[in-house]
């Protein structure tokens, strides 16, 4: 049976959810007037970059859109972006597509996503509403790197 991505709504400890704004992801308060994205998550079959201590390697996409999260260096800084790509196209590739890969690690009831291309850089939300989802190497008070994956299936 062909693999299918798992679907989740994603939320942080301040009850901010991920929202698509144009071709960018931003954090916005969980509210009735805001349509949060449904995150597609599927494991990478290639084990080339695997590191069990860091978590399982996954691709992340936006359900209903041919958009996937990937990491690239812009002006010397690792940056989180959305690229037009179907998550299943990444999945069927025999070779791991490193820029699109994240280590998914569980910390208690939360999930943490670390870039495979840029070890030590994590997907994060700012404490301020309306700011883009970004990559950070500073885990702590000013940035939130722990997320709740809420099942929406």
């Amino acid at each position: 049976r062909e693999a299918a991505p798992k679907s989740y709504a994603i939320r942080d400890s301040r009850q901010m959810v991920w929202v698509l704004s144009g071709n960018s992801l931003i954090a916005a308060p969980l509210s009735r007037s805001i349509k949060p994205v449904t995150l597609h998550l599927i494991a990478c079959r290639d084990t080339e970059f695997s590191d069990k201590e860091k978590g399982n390697m996954v691709y992340l996409g936006i359900k209903g859109k041919d958009l996937c999260l990937f990491c690239a260096e812009i002006q010397g800084k690792p940056t989180l972006q959305l690229k037009e790509k179907n998550i299943m196209d990444l999945y069927v590739e025999k070779k791991a597509q490193k820029p699109f890969l994240f280590f998914h690690n569980k910390e208690g009831s939360t999930s943490v996503f670390q870039s495979v291309s840029y070890p030590g850089w994590f997907i994060a939300t700012s404490t301020t509403s309306g700011q883009p989802i970004f990559l950070t190497k500073e885990r702590g008070i000013t940035n939130n790197t722990n997320f709740y994956l809420d099942s929406v299936e």
């Epitope: 709504a9 939320r11 400890s13 301040r14 009850q15 901010m16 916005a28 308060p29 969980l30 509210s31 009735r32 007037s33 805001i34 949060p36 208690g108 009831s109 939360t110 404490t127 509403s129 709740y148 809420d150 099942s151 929406v152």
Partner: antibody, heavy 122, light 111 residues
């Protein structure tokens, strides 16, 4: 139909720990995207959120009470409980349990228990 | 002191329209978290009256309506009836507290 029922002693001595339980019927305490809260109301006063626990087991507490509050879930009994330590007369209130769903009631509480009066007195 | 501010009391004659305000800040209502309203009849538990700023749960009469703008919200009751006499509370979420916050409550008297 989801129903909540608070239970526990109606009288607690000063400096002791207040313990209350909320029994959930008509639904599961582990239901996806659900949060469960404790709210209190001192006699003649307004509502005060004490803290919450959600289906992931994550807890959130009112900063003004955080050092004294513990909220936990017993999935086998379909219950969640409140412990408030070192109580004083100021903790005398009607205590309510309530619930909501993240993507349906959007951080509001749509089902409430009927409340239980707890008096702190020696 | 409540995080959300409501007038302590409002009153109106039967058939009239009354509004109850709820003022917050940039970390709750102003941060675009929803406002919910509860009705508490004497001696009973609060009941959800409006959720998500302006939505009525089933069974709530359309005489009750909610709105939100900036850092404030309001509850309007039209065609006031004797049975509307109750305490009304607004509630939202505050990201700086990582928690739920209530208004101090407003006592509605039907004259």
């Amino acid at each position: 139909e989801l129903q909540l029922q608070e239970s526990g002693p109606g009288l607690v001595k000063p400096s002791e720990t207040l313990s209350l339980t909320c029994t959930v019927s008509g639904g599961s305490i582990t239901a996806s995207n659900t949060y469960w809260g404790w709210i209190r109301q001192p006699p003649g006063k307004g509502l005060e959120w004490i803290g919450s626990i959600d289906y992931t087991g994550s807890t959130y507490y009112n900063p003004s009470l955080k050092s004294r509050v513990t909220i936990s879930v017993d999935t086998s009994k379909n219950q969640f409980s409140l412990k408030l330590s070192s109580v004083t007369a100021a903790d005398t209130a009607v205590y309510y349990c309530a619930t909501g769903k993240y993507y349906e009631t959007y951080l509001g509480f749509d089902v409430w228990g009927q409340g239980t009066l707890v008096t702190v007195s020696s | 002191e409540s995080v959300l501010t409501q007038p302590p009391s409002v009153s109106g004659a039967p058939g009239q329209r009354v509004t109850i305000s709820c003022t917050g800040s940039s970390s709750n209502i102003g941060a675009h978290y929803d406002v919910h309203w509860y009705q508490q009849l004497p001696g009973t538990a609060p009941k959800l009256l409006i959720y998500g700023n302006d939505n009525r749960p089933s069974g709530v009469p359309d005489r009750f309506s909610g709105s939100k703008s900036g850092t404030s919200a309001s509850l309007a009751i039209t065609g006031l009836q004797a049975e509307d006499e109750a305490d009304y509370y607004c509630q939202s979420y505050d990201y700086s507290l990582s928690g739920y916050v209530f208004g101090g409550g407003t006592k509605l008297t039907v004259l």
